[in-house]
Interface confidence: low
């Protein structure tokens, strides 16, 4: 029985207080245990060794469970996906007891929190997904998933965070609930991947020789592993892998008097290779001596005339095109001609004389090596 008391206070003439009390004995109604524990919540704890669950009843009181199946408000040795019935009572509540149906969740190891981030996008996105890696008999409709990443909350099996900063750590906490009872949770700290490096800044890019060029640059600010330097002449492209510490590269074995377009980008090999933007520049190599003319022929067109022809050099190596023919008799230069084409008609030579014919190409800057043939005029037929 509980006592409900009502009190009234009056003052006597002497100023002392006189208290008269009326006490009524009542029997207040206790709630039923079914009512008191109507909204009881349960946490399920999984034992990986035994593969069994413990249900922790979230009550403050030391409740009594029918058949003594509770210890410290915990129900032990519950099999996954099997229902167990627990009768809950306490001296603060009356019959009927609360009959709690424990709907035991699936085994924790049957779920795996998987990083589903696409490697190509791993620099700015995070994807996390709960995977069912083994079958179970529980009703999947009763399973709900929750993620919290920073101040963002998601009620999905899979989440995708986008527009993130590269090389930053993000923490995500997740839990799985079965019939609104949490039975497993996981936390992941994921560092976004390295981002694409920035563009290198080309300081200068020039050629000071026929076969050489030089490029210097400042590296990009962001992390990178190496550089790729490509140089293109006409449709031919050659690429080099350059060490990250280089800030200058001397290009060798270039073709003279040729325009080269250079592109330089940094790259980083992270989850995938990420290429930074390419910086471009170009130069034209200096002239050089052309190669030798070839297929030179000297043929007699009459007793004292010769026809000299040759094919153009394989490499002109300069801006202009001019063919030169020098004709010597002994050590004396008797003719020196220059044509746009390698086609010379040499007339009025001495009969029965040995001549040396030297043909070469001049590109406007340099002469090439001469092609030398010896030919003799014949006796005059008349």
């Amino acid at each position: 029985a509980y006592l409900n008391a009502s009190e009234t206070t009056t003052l006597s003439p002497s100023g002392s207080a006189v208290i008269s009390t009326t006490t009524i004995a009542t029997t207040p109604s206790k709630p039923t245990c079914d009512e008191k524990y109507a909204n009881i919540t349960v946490d399920y704890l999984y034992n990986k060794e035994t593969k069994l669950f413990t249900a922790k009843l979230n009550v403050n009181e030391n409740v009594e469970c029918g058949n003594n199946t509770c210890t410290n408000n915990e129900v032990h040795n519950l099999t996954e996906c099997k229902n167990a019935s627990v009768s809950i009572s306490h001296n603060s509540c009356t019959a009927p007891d609360k009959t709690l149906i424990l709907d035991v969740p699936p085994g924790v190891e049957k779920f795996q929190l998987h990083d589903c981030t696409q490697v190509e996008k791993a620099d700015t996105t995070i994807c996390l997904k709960w995977k069912n890696i083994e079958t179970f008999t529980c009703d999947t409709q009763n399973i709900t998933y929750r993620f919290q990443c920073g101040n963002m909350i998601f009620d999905n099996k899979e989440i995708k965070l986008e527009n993130l900063e590269p090389e930053h750590e993000y923490k995500c906490d997740s839990e799985i609930l079965y019939n609104n009872h949490k039975f497993t949770n996981a936390s992941k700290i994921i560092k976004t991947d390295f981002g694409s490096p920035g563009e290198p800044q080309i300081i200068f890019c020039r050629s000071e020789a026929a076969h050489q060029g030089v490029i210097t640059w400042n590296p990009p600010q962001r992390s990178f592993h190496n550089f790729t330097l490509c140089y293109i002449k006409e449709t031919e492209k050659d690429c080099l892998n350059l060490d990250k510490n280089l800030i200058k590269y001397d290009l060798q074995n270039l073709k003279p008097y040729t325009k080269y377009v250079l592109s330089l980008h940094a790259y980083i090999i992270a989850k995938v290779q990420r290429n930074g933007s390419a910086a471009m520049c170009h130069f034209t190599t200096k002239s050089a001596p052309p190669s030798q003319v070839w297929n030179m022929t000297v043929s007699m067109t009459s007793d004292n005339s010769m026809h000299v022809k040759c094919r153009p050099p394989r490499d002109r190596n300069g801006p202009h095109e001019r063919y030169h023919l020098e004709v010597e008799a002994g050590n004396t230069l008797v003719r020196n001609e220059s044509h746009k084409n390698c086609d010379f008609r040499v007339k009025d030579l001495q009969y029965s004389t040995d001549y040396t014919f030297k043909a070469y190409f001049h590109n406007g800057d340099y002469p090439g090596e001469p092609f030398i043939l010896h030919h003799s005029t014949s006796y005059n037929s008349k």
Epitope: H211, Q212, H225, N226, T228, D238, C239, L240, N241, L242, D243, N245, L246, D250, Q252, N253, I269, V272, Q273
Partner: antibody, heavy 119, light 106 residues
Framework: EVQLVESGGGLVQPGGSLRLSCAAS????????MAWIRQAPGKGLEWVAS????????YYPDSVKDRFTISRDNSKNTLYLQMNSLRAEDTAVYYC????????????WGQGTLVTVSS | DIQMTQSPSSLSASVGDRVTITCKAS??????LDWYQQKPGKAPKLLIH???NLHTGIPSRFSGSGSGTDYTLTISSLQPEDFATYYC????????FGGGTKVEIK
Amino acid sequence: EVQLVESGGGLVQPGGSLRLSCAASGFTFTNFWMAWIRQAPGKGLEWVASISSSGGSIYYPDSVKDRFTISRDNSKNTLYLQMNSLRAEDTAVYYCVKFHHYSGGGDAWGQGTLVTVSS
Amino acid sequence: DIQMTQSPSSLSASVGDRVTITCKASQNINKYLDWYQQKPGKAPKLLIHYTNNLHTGIPSRFSGSGSGTDYTLTISSLQPEDFATYYCLQHSSRWTFGGGTKVEIK
């Protein structure tokens, strides 16, 4: 004709030193990266050291770092490998190699010089 | 450091056979891969540079392919002079050789 001729190999005691030389001819030495590559008896090829055309960039694997020094004298068309603190596992034929592209395409190799480290 | 795994370590074949040798890198090497041939007592000889470029004077029966981490040397029709040991070399980051493949007469 491109030619690379190594010299300086021989028998040396563990902890000793040797200096290998490689005389280059038949190409413009100053234009190309060079390297030393070795081959232990009956084994595969192992890169030992590389040097850029100007000598400004040098690379070693961990196995020889701080013990071997690659250098070049472009005025003499010669490549060198100074080997200190030699160990039995350094026993090998050492080849001098010319790279056709920046860091690859070893298109010319010397005949090799044998270094034997033994007590 | 990048590791190169070359396979097989040896193989037996007959003249006229098609032979394939592979090299696998421990990370992306961006096609920076050469192939060399070595005969006993001789220095290695460059066959292919930058994955698929045939070196001057090398017969067209040799070819190379690959990208990323996986590379292949193919000899379309094995000739008597092709019995030798073959090595791959990556030069994407420092330099690493494969362990070699000895091609023997069956």
